[in-house]
């Protein structure tokens, strides 16, 4: 009787675009058939995708996001078959180009000022604020009360993701006008 | 630039489903993000889900995960939101939005579709 598989890996974080990952069937054995799993379905005919050690090991070159799946190995032979349990792989990824919430640009005086920044990465990533280049907190909302017209300038999201290495931005003008100048946006 | 168009809001019972479309044109080669976003009324516009372009992927508000869920179409050039057990705390404007990527990124915003669930 075979015994339950388990899928070992080479590479448990792997990065998006940069690295690949070898999954590999365990235990080796004679007169044995390997067979694989994704999400519960066979393996997509992928350029990405490479069989090799007689079906024992899965290789996913130049992994991406959408890798970050169940994977499942199973063996059989004449006698019996077994499957491992799932192993999910973790693609770290990001951080994409932000989105800064709401889309105005101009407030009125008096107004409060509620940026909100959102950046899709694996982990999470971290954010930061210029306003006119200066630095301020590093949390994802930049919340200002009663804004004046000296708040006026460029807002910039900052974002980096320390596990993959990369960073991103966007930016944002915001013109604020005295109170009865302009028919302003309030927040 | 970007135009993004979105459709599919309603009135639905508590406990329906509804499908959001959003669609985007114009300078749609530099898109990254396609994002949706609510705004209910007295309230800030918050973040609900998103899906990277060109790759895919979801990443979702924890208020929504396992009832919403996010996708794209590449054929149809639309990225979809579909919502399921919908509850009257669901009623908000959704907002498509998308970031660019480039030398200067930007964001873009749709004009939002109303979703009404009724208990």
């Known amino acids: 009787e075979l015994p339950k598989p388990s899928i070992s890996s080479n590479n448990s974080k792997p990065v998006e675009d940069k690295d690949a990952v070898a999954f590999t069937c365990e235990p080796e054995a004679q007169n044995t058939t390997y067979l694989w799993w994704v999400n519960g379905q066979s393996l997509p005919v992928s350029p990405r995708l490479q069989l090799s050690n007689g079906n024992r090991t899965l290789t996913l070159f130049n992994v991406t996001r959408n890798d970050a799946r169940a994977y499942v190995c199973g063996i059989q032979n004449s006698v019996s078959a077994n499957r491992s349990d799932p192993v999910t792989l973790d693609v770290l990824y990001g951080p994409d180009t932000p989105i800064i919430s709401p889309p105005d640009s101009s407030y009125l005086s008096g107004a409060n000022l509620n940026l909100s920044c959102h950046s899709a990465s694996n982990p999470s990533p971290q954010y930061s604020w210029r306003i006119n280049g200066i630095p301020q907190q590093h949390t994802q909302v930049l919340f200002i009360a009663k804004i004046t017209p000296n708040n006026n300038g460029t807002y910039a999201c900052f974002v980096s993701n320390l596990a993959t290495g990369r960073n991103n931005s966007i930016v944002k003008s915001i013109t604020v006008s005295a109170s009865g100048t302009s028919p302003g946006l309030s927040a | 630039e970007v135009d993004l168009v979105e459709s599919g809001g309603g009135l639905v019972q508590a406990g329906g489903s509804l499908r959001l479309s959003c669609a985007p044109s114009?300078?749609?080669?530099?898109?990254?993000?396609m994002a949706w976003f609510r705004q209910a009324p007295g309230k800030e516009r918050e973040f609900v889900a998103s899906?990277?372009?060109?790759?895919?992927?979801?990443s979702y508000a924890d208020s929504v995960k396992g009832r919403f869920t996010i996708s794209r179409d590449a054929t149809k050039n639309t990225v979809y939101l579909q919502i399921n057990s919908l509850e009257p705390e669901d009623t908000a404007v959704y907002y498509c939005?998308?970031?660019?990527?480039?030398?200067?990124?930007?964001?873009?915003w749709g004009q939002g579709t109303q979703v009404t669930v009724s208990s």
């Open positions: 114009g300078r749609t080669s530099s898109l990254d993000t």
């Open positions: 939005a998308a970031s660019t990527r480039g030398i200067v990124s930007d964001n873009y």
């Open positions: 899906t990277n372009w060109n790759r895919g992927g979801a």
